[in-house]
């Protein structure tokens, strides 16, 4: 049992996570994350599963956030903007979008960097998972600190 | 002892700060802040030091955030994007980047405004300091509410 | 009394809200919100009033945030950037700006989407209200997850 967990006592441990983006060869639009660098994983009441979703064991209100930096060019990209979505999958429920942000592609060559930040307070059920989806994962920047994902239980 | 500190009892006081950007004639890339306007400084367990870093006295998990609004022009700026970095200096450790955001310069004349928001959960040691670094401080907007920096202890 | 309120006991209930943007025919620059979709309203210690402001009953430190996605075009808009402001109205006080973000309009046609995120820690008095103001509400995107507003009490 770690120091975060002990601060509030066994009944109400601190629950928080912050994970770091990881480049992936997978063709999925769901971003991949890792417990590397200056990451946070308070205890086993929140876990990173399959490198793609943060899963919580306890029901409650959570502040959930994601930051995505990407590099794109208007001519080389589809007409649609770059969209990052924070999504929820609860046991027995369909996936749903919690938050989205959209940025039109830059005219800078070869590509122009832009950063998106998402964050909000949501109730999560036991076993609920949150994940981040983007329109084009190949455009995401994985340099130190550029793209991250996390939550904290209120 | 103020009302924030008393809410949770002496053992677990609320710790939070929100400081306001200040224009600086210094040539450093580290942004300057002030306890002015509608600022927050919950108690002496978090302090603003040298106008540039928020320093905490207690170990724990903190949600740390910064918002930077800047005005730049592609032709008048270097080719590199505007980057804002949230950085950490812990006693006996090197400075390190926690979070970064990048925005390509605007083509608007004389300059185009853009806003960056950074935020994440990190463990801080006693005496740790967090600060904000930017590629070009002269481009930062200091109008009311545009650029700010803060943290809260979970 | 709901489950959020009970978690911390009657003396220190959880207080949090997350509301969803709503298109409005009103000509006001203050954004409209609704308790719809995946919204949060922890208890009656925070309320959405007139569909435009979050009002708190208890004094304390709150992390307040807003996200606004908008679609605009440089030629079709005024020369001034799109600005989103998080504002405070306390009983017996003038309204004041807490946070602002600015983004220059896109050159994309018919319009280019961009997202703004605002967030910070502020002390609120009993009866204080926070609201979001934008330069042009007609440009705001109301698709699922694009524009939201919330707070949590520390």
């Amino acid at each position: 049992e770690n120091s975060f967990e002990m601060q509030k006592g066994d009944q109400n441990p601190q629950i928080a996570a912050h994970v770091i983006s990881e480049a992936s060869s997978k063709t999925t639009s769901v971003l991949q994350w890792a417990e590397k660098g200056y990451y946070t994983m308070s205890n086993n009441l929140v876990t990173l599963e399959n490198g793609k979703q943060l899963t919580v064991k306890r029901q409650g209100l959570y502040y959930i956030y994601a930051q995505v930096t990407f590099c794109s060019n208007r001519e080389a990209s589809s007409q649609a903007p770059f969209i990052a979505s924070l999504c929820l999958k609860s046991p027995g429920r369909f996936e749903r979008i919690l938050l989205r942000a959209a940025n039109t592609h830059s005219s800078a060559k070869p590509c122009g960097q832009q950063s998106i930040h998402l964050g909000g307070v949501f109730e999560l059920q036991p076993g609920a998972s949150v994940f981040v989806n983007v329109t084009d994962p190949s455009q995401v920047s994985h340099g130190t600190g550029f793209t991250s994902f996390g939550l904290l239980k209120l | 002892e103020n009302s924030f500190e008393m809410q949770k009892g002496d053992q677990n006081p609320q710790i939070a700060a929100h400081v306001i950007s200040e224009a600086s004639s210094k040539t450093t890339s580290v942004l300057q802040w002030a306890e002015k306007g509608y600022y927050t400084m919950s108690n002496n367990l978090v302090t603003l030091e040298n106008g540039k870093q928020l320093t905490v006295k207690r170990q724990g998990l903190y949600y740390i955030y910064a918002q930077v609004t800047f005005c730049s022009n592609r032709e008048a700026s270097s080719q590199a994007p505007f980057i804002a970095s949230l950085c950490l200096k812990s006693p006996g450790r090197f400075e390190r980047i926690l979070l970064r955001a990048a925005n390509t310069h605007s083509s608007a004349k004389p300059c185009g405004q853009q806003s960056i928001h950074l935020g994440g959960v990190f463990e801080l040691q006693p005496g740790a300091s967090v600060f904000v670094n930017v590629t070009d401080p002269s481009q930062v907007s200091h109008g009311t509410g545009f650029t700010s920096f803060g943290l809260l202890k979970l | 009394e709901n489950s959020f309120e009970m978690q911390k006991g009657d003396q220190n209930p959880q207080i949090a809200a997350h509301v969803i943007s709503e298109a409005s025919s009103k000509t006001t620059s203050v954004l409209q919100w609704a308790e719809k979709g995946y919204y949060t309203m922890s208890n009656n210690l925070v309320t959405l009033e007139n569909g435009k402001q979050l009002t708190v009953k208890r004094q304390g430190l709150y992390y307040i945030y807003a996200q606004v996605t908008f679609c605009s075009n440089r030629e079709a808009s005024s020369q001034a950037p799109f600005i989103a402001s998080l504002c405070l109205k306390s009983p017996g006080r003038f309204e004041r700006i807490l946070l602002r973000a600015a983004n220059t309009h896109s050159s994309a046609k018919p319009c280019g989407q961009q997202s703004i995120h605002l967030g910070g820690v502020f002390e609120l008095q009993p009866g204080a209200s926070v609201f979001v103001n934008v330069t042009d509400p007609s440009q705001v995107s109301h698709g699922t997850g694009f524009t939201s507003f919330g707070l949590l009490k520390l």
Epitope: - | C87, K89, E95 | -
Partner: nanobody
Framework: EVQLVESGGGLVQAGGSLRLSCAAS????????MAWFRQAPGKEREFVAA????????DYSDSLKDRFTISRDNAKATLYLRMNNLKPEDTAVYYC??????????????????????WGQGTLVTVSS
Amino acid sequence: EVQLVESGGGLVQAGGSLRLSCAASGRTPLNYHMAWFRQAPGKEREFVAAISSLLGSTDYSDSLKDRFTISRDNAKATLYLRMNNLKPEDTAVYYCAARETTHYSTSDRVNEMRNYDYWGQGTLVTVSS
């Protein structure tokens, strides 16, 4: 590539003071963490003090922090070490070291030699009793 050249060493009596300098040339030293180490005759090289690249925050060896002060002048690209109340046991070759800000390793402790990318040739300080 950064070149580091120390100066200011010499013979000094116990209780005296010295100021060492380290001139950095090459790529901008603004982006480097800088430190002083020392190596006494027949002993291992040990950490003295470090100063961070952005904040200018300082870290010291516990046994030296009351007498030694590290500082830097970014305009002159120079690192300094002010040494007061010198003792015979301070006799050593003093080395200037630099580490790139962007450099990450498994350890990020400022007092570990392995974490520095560039070293000067050293300057000898002799304290007589």
